[in-house]
Interface confidence: low
């Protein structure tokens, strides 16, 4: 758990429901999937679905779960002790430095550039500058097919992601 | 968590040859273009060679002719072949992702070539 | 073959204290990219694309720079940012050694 925990990571409180277990603290801590109750006398846990604790933890309430969001699929649901997992939609990616929103993919490579890389949840296509002795189709070329340049003449990525 | 593990460094006379392996876990490595870089000791980074996740390949002009990378996305491996080794081609290699911005590397493996 | 010169080659600067290291290019570059190196480690990604910075890395690093001058900047020295940084487009330059006073 990260220890700047804001209010907004935080799930609505709730006071502890019959059906909610309870524990008692170990060294005044409360193991994955559960929170410490106020007086710091109970683990209380998670409700599933819902929200969630990943480590030993003194934390007045659970985190609330992440929602996955449109043009995003989920790959695994909010457990007592996991956040949903999502990731992006095929054919877009979330860039490392804007990880709020998932992204288009690029469909090719600008003229005078070649992919290199696929588009990927994680990564836009990577183009880089054609060199002489490619194809001059957008395709990557055939397998005996080398790029003869020198580091002086790079192949600079114009590829968004990092 | 992205995993790059080399192997096949060593000990190795002028004119000897070598083949390095890397190999790749945590992500889909057949989309990707991988890198091979060296650092010789007390020195900074030299690129060596990169391949696409097809079948484009580039490579340093001081190791032109004389080494291969390839790659087996059944295996999550790349390959570099070092053939004709001078001693100026002692360092440690690392296999990186990505043809140039390389995000990920692994630890290295020594490659010492001497008499 | 493009030549990337880095300086100063070894500097100390004091926890708190704001560094600069530059990158000169023999030739005009569109993009640069920065890695950092501990004794005995292998490199990390620390900025990308000149001025991107890269997962994990500390907001008090930049970059910035175009044509033949990048530059690397640390707004607040700390102990933990001793080490050797690499500019790189395909070779790198010699690289900086930041020590901690």
């Known amino acids: 758990e990260s220890a700047l925990i804001t209010q907004q990571d935080l799930a609505p409180q709730q006071r502890a429901a019959p059906q909610q277990k309870r524990s008692s603290p170990s060294e005044g801590l409360c193991p994955p999937g559960h929170h410490i109750s106020e007086d710091g006398r109970d683990c209380i846990s998670c409700k599933y679905g819902q929200d969630y604790s990943t480590h030993w933890n003194d934390l007045l309430f659970c985190l609330r779960c992440t929602r996955c969001d449109s043009g995003e699929v989920e790959l695994s649901p909010c457990t007592t002790t996991r956040n949903t997992v999502c990731q992006c939609e095929e054919g877009t990616f979330r860039e490392e430095d804007s990880p709020e929103m998932c992204r288009k993919c690029r469909t090719g490579c600008p003229r005078g550039m070649v992919k290199v890389g696929d588009c990927t949840p994680w990564s836009d296509i990577e183009c880089v500058h054609k060199e002489s002795g490619t194809k001059h189709s957008g395709e990557v070329p055939a397998v005996e097919e080398t790029v003869t340049s020198s580091p002086g003449t790079p192949a600079s990525p114009c590829s968004l992601s990092g | 968590e992205v995993q790059l593990l080399e192997s096949g460094g060593g000990l190795v006379q002028p004119g000897g040859s070598l083949k390095l392996s890397c190999a790749a876990s945590?992500?889909?490595?057949?989309?990707?273009?991988m890198s091979w870089v060296r650092q010789a000791p007390g020195k900074g980074l030299e690129w060596v060679s990169s391949?696409?996740?097809?079948?484009?390949?580039q490579y340093a002009d001081s190791v032109k002719g004389r080494f291969t990378i390839s790659r087996d996305n059944s295996k999550n491996t790349l390959y570099l072949q070092m053939n004709s080794l001078r001693a100026e081609d002692t360092a440690v290699y690392y296999c990186?992702?990505?043809?140039?911005?390389?995000?990920?590397w692994g630890q290295g493996t020594l490659v010492i070539v001497s008499s | 073959d493009i030549q990337l010169t880095q300086s100063p080659a070894i500097m100390s600067a004091s926890p708190g204290e704001k560094v600069t290291m530059t990158c000169r290019a023999s030739s005009s570059v569109s993009y640069m990219n920065w890695y950092q190196q501990k004794s005995g480690t292998s490199p990390k990604r620390w900025i990308y694309d000149t001025s991107k910075v890269a997962s994990g890395v500390p907001y008090r690093f930049s970059g910035s720079g175009s044509g033949t001058s990048y530059s690397l900047t640390i707004s607040s020295m700390e102990a933990e940012d001793a080490a050797t940084y690499y500019c790189q487009q395909w070779s790198s330059g010699q690289g900086t050694k930041l020590e901690i006073k």
């Open positions: 945590g992500f889909t490595f057949s989309s990707y273009a």
């Open positions: 990186a992702k990505r043809w140039n911005r390389f995000d990920y």
């Open positions: 391949i696409a996740n097809g079948k484009m390949t």
